[in-house]
Amino acid sequence: RQQWELQGDRRCQSQLERANLRPCEQHLMQKIQRDEDSYGRDPYSPSQDPYSPSQDPDRRDPYSPSPYDRRGAGSSQHQERCCNELNEFENNQRCMCEALQQIMENQSDRLQGRQQEQQFKRELRNLPQQCGLRAPQRCDLEVESGGRDRY
């Protein structure tokens, strides 16, 4: 992996091997399909997604970066399991990036058309924040080989 030079990071590799990122893939695929199916939905309007309820940002702990509450009753099973898996990477931003890249690579063949791929990438980029976790400062989700800092 060019961007993060992870070859030497054995701890990250073992974390990635242990992690089950399938619930994240399922959650994201369901989400983009649900967004596509929403009749008349403006794709740029604030999310009306029942799994991501908007909350008052003033109510939350300033050190919890997301208004998404993992314990919320409205959370989907896939999202909750996904967030639990991603939680393992929270204090290693290089490893969090690698996990996101792995999700992208696993799903890239299943995405139909540029629009679906772009929407998947958008949701994936923001997945850590949706889970109330820190996002990596930089993370390239392009699946083609080569090329740094292409977003």
């Epitope: 794709p43 740029y44 309007s45 604030p46 999310s47 991501s52 908007s54 909350q55 940002p57 300033p62 050190y63 970066p65 208004p67 204090n91 290693n92 931003q93 290089r94 990036c97 996101l100 772009q118 990438k121 958008r122 980029r125 923001n126 924040q129 820190r134 996002a135 990596p136 400062q137 930089r138 993370c139 977003y151």
Partner: antibody, heavy 116, light 108 residues
Framework: QVQLMESGGGVVQPGGSLRLSCAAS????????MHWVRQTPDKGLEWVAY????????DYVDSVKGRFTISRDNSNNTLYLKMTDLRPQDTAMYYC?????????WGQGTRVTVSS | DIQMTQSPSSLSASVGDKVTITCRAS??????LSWFQQKPGKAPKILIY???TLQSGVPSRFSGSGSGTHFTLTISSLQPEDFASYFC??????????FGQGTKVEVK
Amino acid sequence: QVQLMESGGGVVQPGGSLRLSCAASGFDFPGYGMHWVRQTPDKGLEWVAYIWYDARSEDYVDSVKGRFTISRDNSNNTLYLKMTDLRPQDTAMYYCAVGAPLEGYWGQGTRVTVSS
Amino acid sequence: DIQMTQSPSSLSASVGDKVTITCRASQNIADYLSWFQQKPGKAPKILIYAASTLQSGVPSRFSGSGSGTHFTLTISSLQPEDFASYFCQQSYTSPTWTFGQGTKVEVK
């Protein structure tokens, strides 16, 4: 190539209003959270506001809560900061910046001066 | 809130000198730290992110190190274009960011 261009700054009297704009290009704007940051010679850099990629939520520094509103138009790749009830201490250079995971890209800034 | 304390606030150096600037966080921020360079009248330009990762296109004389609460920016051999202000930024509490007060590198 990521480009951010702020506009809308100017001189305004205390209690007045301004709306800053930030035109974005060279990246997938609708897929990233966005920030406003300001800079003064005495206080240095201060984070001001953040908006989620899909505008579902916003965050503000305490000193501007209730006075400033961050918003975005993803169809036009534009970020906004509506500033009301402006005070002399809001005088600063205002920058827009991209959020994670594309941190580090800032615009050139637009100057806001609040003075009677 | 996390405070970022940067030192020194200014320093005088000559071309070819090794320059070290430090940034301390009031609590553990892991490696969620960036270093920026700013020249008068210009926007801040990122040099380093994730404490030690060099931004693409930035000369290799710039390097960053540290984790937790103590971080360092080193310029191994100062060049004429490096006379500028430098500041650190933490994004551990993202989307809230906090910044160091800055270090001005001047000609000796």
